[in-house]
C-alpha cells in the first residue's frame, strides 16, 4: 500500500492488498476498503460503472461480468484500486463490438479477458484469413487489444480476439472494423455548366458534383454577396469505399431578372475547402 508523510491525507487501504485478484466463477468477491474518510466503491468495466457506499464490497456469486476495476475513494479524493478477474472458462472475453478507427490513429478492440493466465492473447482474421501484414497491435488483458495506426485498407476488416486455453485456440465474437478516412486533400467540385442565359420565367437548374473520401464532406450552394439559404436537392453514391460522390442540384423554377448573378458551389472538409461558380443571366 502507498506510504505518505505523517499529517498528509493518505489513500484508502484495500484488502486483499494486491493490484490484481483472480476468483473463479460462482465464488465470492469480498473487498474491504479501510479509511476513516471512506466515501464509495466504484466498479468499472466496458459499458458500465457502478457505485457502492458500503466499505465492504461483496458479490456472493461472481460472474464473468463482475470482472473489472474496483476503486475505493475517500473524502480527500484519494483512491486505490484492485482489478478483479472472474475466471469463467465459458466466457473468456467481455466484448463491445462497436469498432471504429480513424485513419492513422490507434483504435481499441474491446475484448478484455476474464482470465489473465491464458496465453497468446492476440487478434485473428475471420474464417481463417490472415490479418494484413502491416497490422500491428498491443494486447492489454484489462482493456482489450490496441490496433496501432489504422490504415484505410483495414476498412470492414473482420477479426476476432483470440487466446490459447489448454492448447486450444478460443475466439471471441466477430468484430468489424469501420475506418473513418482522414481527409488528405480538398474536395473535388465541378459544375454542370459555367454560365446560363435564360429568358424570364424559364427554369434555372444547375448541378454541382462533389467528390471526396467520405460522406462527411460538407457542401452547399451560395449566392455571392447574399446570405439567403438556397433550396437544393441531393443525390449521393458510394462508388466503393472512400469514393463518395454527391450531386447538389439548385433549381429556380421561374427565373426573374433579379435572380441574375453568380452562384457558388462550396465544399469543405477538415483538410480545406474548394468552390466552383456558375453565372446566371436572366433577360426579359
Amino acid at each position: 500500500q502507498p506510504s505518505v508523510s505523517p499529517g498528509e491525507p493518505s489513500p484508502p487501504s484495500i484488502h486483499p492488498g494486491k493490484s490484481d485478484l483472480i476468483v473463479r466463477v460462482g465464488d465470492e468477491i469480498r473487498l474491504l476498503c479501510t479509511d476513516p474518510g471512506f466515501v464509495k466503491w466504484t466498479f468499472e468495466i466496458l459499458d458500465e460503472t457502478n457505485e457502492n457506499k458500503q466499505n465492504e464490497w461483496i458479490t456472493e456469486k461472481a460472474e464473468a461480468t463482475n470482472t473489472g476495476k474496483y476503486t475505493c475513494t475517500n473524502k480527500h479524493g484519494l483512491s486505490n484500486s484492485i482489478y478483479v478477474f472472474v475466471r469463467d472458462p465459458a466466457k473468456l472475453f467481455l466484448v463491445d463490438r462497436s469498432l471504429y478507427g480513424k485513419e492513422d490513429n490507434d483504435t481499441l478492440v474491446r475484448c478484455p479477458l476474464t482470465d489473465p493466465e491464458v496465453t497468446n492473447y492476440s487478434l485473428k482474421g475471420c474464417q481463417g484469413k490472415p490479418l494484413p501484414k502491416d497490422l500491428r497491435f498491443i494486447p492489454d488483458p484489462k482493456a482489450g487489444i490496441m490496433i496501432k495506426s489504422v490504415k484505410r485498407a483495414y476498412h470492414r476488416l473482420c477479426l476476432h480476439c483470440s487466446v490459447d486455453q489448454e492448447g486450444e485456440s478460443v475466439l471471441s465474437e466477430k468484430f468489424i472494423l469501420k475506418v473513418r478516412p482522414a481527409f488528405k486533400a480538398v474536395p473535388v467540385v465541378s459544375v454542370s455548366k459555367a454560365s446560363y442565359l435564360l429568358r424570364e420565367g424559364e427554369e434555372f437548374t444547375v448541378t454541382c458534383t462533389i467528390k471526396d473520401v467520405s460522406s462527411s464532406v460538407y457542401s452547399t450552394w451560395k449566392r455571392e454577396n447574399s446570405q439567403t439559404k438556397l433550396q437544393e436537392k441531393y443525390n449521393s453514391w458510394h462508388h466503393g469505399d472512400f469514393n463518395y460522390e454527391r450531386q447538389a442540384t439548385l433549381t429556380i423554377s421561374s427565373a426573374r431578372v433579379n435572380d441574375s448573378g453568380v452562384f457558388m458551389c462550396y465544399a469543405n472538409n477538415t483538410f480545406g475547402s474548394a468552390n466552383v461558380t456558375t453565372t446566371l443571366e436572366v433577360v426579359d
Partner: antibody, heavy 117, light 111 residues
C-alpha cells in the same frame, strides 16, 4: 445504471440558435460514441450525427451538416448539440443515444424544441 | 443513403396472436454475416427502446415473445404471442453505413 439526462423542453424564436445538453452517468463517458436523433411526426426518426468517444471527432448526416454542431465536455460527462438558424422545420424532439456493442442501447428522454415567434 | 421500407404502416392484431413486421433495405446491411439491423419499440411520450440487435439478438430484459430474423436486405420482427402492453410503434434501423437510417415505423394496435 446508465442514464442520459436531457432537459424536457426549449422554446426558441425563429432565426435564433439552441444548445441542448445530454448529461451521461453510470458509465465511462469517454469510452462510448454519442449519437443524436431527431423525431418529428412527419419525418419520423432521423439520425443527425455522432460524436466519437475519446477524440471528439464528429460525423454528420449531410442533411444536418451546417445546421447542427455536436460537442462534448469530458469533465462534466455531457454531450451537447447546437442547432442554429432555427425555423419551424426544426421543431421536433431531439434524443441523444449511447452506442453500445453496435446498437443504440441507451436513450435520453428527449428535448422538445419548439420554434415560435 | 440506405432506405428502409417498413410494412405494414399499421396493423391490428388480436391478443395472444402473432404480429409480424417487415423491414426491407435498399441495399445489403450485412458484413461477414453480421447484419447491422436493429429493432426498437416506441410508446407515446417515451424514447425508443431497443428490442433486437444485429438482426436476431434479443436485448437483455426484453421478453422472449420478441424475435428477429433476416439477412442482407430483408428483415422481420415477430411478436408471438402479442400482449396488451405491446401496443406501440416499431422501427427498424441500420448502422451499416453512414448516414444511419430508420424505417418509417409500424404502428401496432391490439384488438
Amino acid at each position: 445504471q446508465v442514464q442520459l439526462q436531457q432537459p424536457g423542453a426549449e422554446l426558441v424564436k425563429p432565426g435564433a440558435s439552441v444548445k441542448m445538453s445530454c448529461k451521461a452517468s453510470g458509465y465511462t463517458f469517454t469510452s462510448y460514441n454519442m449519437h443524436w436523433v431527431k423525431q418529428t411526426p412527419g419525418q419520423g426518426l432521423e439520425w443527425i450525427g455522432v460524436i466519437y468517444s475519446g477524440n471528439g471527432d464528429t460525423s454528420y448526416n449531410q442533411k444536418f451538416k451546417g445546421k447542427a454542431t455536436l460537442t462534448a465536455d469530458k469533465s462534466s460527462s455531457t454531450a451537447y448539440m447546437q442547432i442554429n438558424s432555427l425555423t419551424s422545420e426544426d421543431s421536433a424532439v431531439y434524443y441523444c443515444a449511447r452506442e453500445r456493442d453496435t446498437r443504440f442501447g441507451n436513450w435520453g428522454q428527449g428535448t422538445l424544441v419548439t420554434v415560435s415567434a | 443513403n440506405i432506405v428502409l421500407t417498413q410494412s405494414p404502416a399499421s396493423l391490428a392484431v388480436s391478443l395472444g396472436l402473432r404480429a409480424t413486421i417487415s423491414c426491407r433495405a435498399s441495399e445489403s446491411v450485412d458484413i461477414y454475416g453480421n447484419s447491422f439491423m436493429h429493432w426498437y419499440q416506441q410508446k407515446p411520450g417515451q424514447p425508443p427502446k431497443l428490442l433486437i440487435y444485429l438482426a436476431s439478438n434479443l436485448e437483455s430484459g426484453v421478453p422472449a415473445r420478441f424475435s428477429g430474423s433476416g439477412s442482407r436486405t430483408d428483415f422481420t420482427l415477430t411478436i408471438d404471442p402479442v400482449e396488451a402492453d405491446d401496443a406501440a410503434t416499431y422501427y427498424c434501423q441500420q448502422n451499416n453505413e453512414d448516414p444511419y437510417t430508420f424505417g418509417g415505423g409500424t404502428k401496432l394496435e391490439i384488438k
